[in-house]
């Protein structure tokens, strides 16, 4: 889980090694702050849980792409 040491900077120290279906993902944000030890992606799930993930992993990139497309598509 993400850790906010000195708000407002949130850092990830460990990544999930389990793939998570895009069905469970609601949004994401990238962590690129130099105050953090590593770049990360934080996914927010449909039940508002936050999960740290490795942006180098293919499933993470695919999930971000999927969420980007969802955001761009207007609801009918």
């Amino acid at each position: 889980q993400p850790d906010a040491i000195n708000a407002p900077v949130t850092c990830c120290y460990n990544f999930t090694n389990r793939k998570i279906s895009v069905q469970r993902l609601a949004s994401y944000r990238r962590i690129t702050s130099s105050k953090c030890p590593k770049e990360a992606v934080i996914f927010k799930t449909i039940v508002a849980k936050e999960i740290c993930a490795d942006p180098k992993q293919k499933w993470v990139q695919d999930s971000m792409d999927h969420l980007d497309k969802q955001t761009q598509t207007p609801k009918t």
Partner: antibody, heavy 120, light 113 residues
Framework: QVQLVQSGAEVKKPGASVKVSCKVS????????MHWVRQAPGKGLEWMGG????????IHAQKFQGRVIMTEDTSTDTAYMELSSLRSEDTAVYYC?????????????WGQGTLVTVSS | DIVMTQSPDSLAVSLGERATINCKSS????????????LVWYQQKPGQPPKLLIY???TRESGVPDRFSGSGSGTDFTLTISSLQAEDVAVYYC?????????FGQGTKVEIK
């Protein structure tokens, strides 16, 4: 394509423990979130527990708390479910199950089942 | 935990006729942001593990015949077999996957009349 192959049938005495294995092929176990579901004879499906990446840990149904241990051997891609203090009502087919597309909360891939009979 | 209740417990339908199974959740399993319902249907034949038929309440899994359809939203859902075939004799289960723990309905047994 994920394949799950479970260990064979077991007969146990009340009070004993049973350990059921589930061997994963086609994926590595660490990519998957393995869950366990049981089914008593002529009854419905009952979720026992499994790895929940949203909580970052293995979670169990309340009724099995303290009696079930779910473990993984990543070197052999094998998941295990150990149930202790067995009673006759634990007689059931035990399934391992997962979602090969990543953790969704439902299961599109199931093991063949392991029948555990508890009888004195 | 979300409680799932199916009805009826069993039904007998003539070959070629329609079979309808209902599933009700104790709270809404609709995620409003994507307008998706987090409900699946499984089919289980004797001596076999369950087989996933439908996810997101109405999306058929690959390879599932189009006589199977799912509908409903919020708390009330239906699985319909439009024209029952002999191979459809089985027990059908709904399951919610909106929140943890995942919970199943008690099952509906479908037989031929």
């Amino acid at each position: 394509q994920v394949q799950l192959v479970q260990s064979g049938a077991e007969v146990k005495k009340p009070g004993a423990s049973v350990k059921v294995s589930c061997k994963v092929s086609g994926y590595t176990l660490t990519e998957l979130s393995m869950h366990w579901v049981r089914q008593a004879p002529g009854k419905g499906l009952e979720w026992m527990g499994g790895f929940d990446p949203e909580n970052g840990e293995t979670i169990h149904a309340q009724k099995f708390q303290g009696r079930v241990i779910m473990t993984e051997d990543t070197s052999t891609d094998t998941a295990y479910m150990e149930l202790s203090s067995l009673r006759s009502e634990d007689t059931a087919v035990y399934y391992c199950a997962t979602d090969q597309g990543g953790y969704s909360g439902y299961f599109d891939c199931w093991g063949q089942g392991t029948l555990v009979t508890v009888s004195s | 935990d979300i409680v799932m209740t199916q009805s009826p417990d069993s039904l007998a339908v003539s070959l070629g006729e329609r079979a309808t199974i209902n599933c009700k959740s104790s709270q809404s399993i609709l995620y409003s942001s994507n307008n998706k319902n987090y409900l699946v249907w499984y089919q289980q034949k004797p001596g076999q593990p369950p087989k996933l038929l439908i996810y997101w309440a109405s999306t058929r899994e690959s390879g599932v015949p189009d006589r199977f359809s799912g509908s409903g939203s919020g708390t009330d859902f239906t699985l319909t077999i439009s024209s029952l075939q002999a191979e459809d004799v089985a027990v059908y289960y709904c399951q919610q996957y909106y929140s943890s723990p995942p919970t199943f309905g008690q099952g509906t047994k479908v037989e031929i009349k």
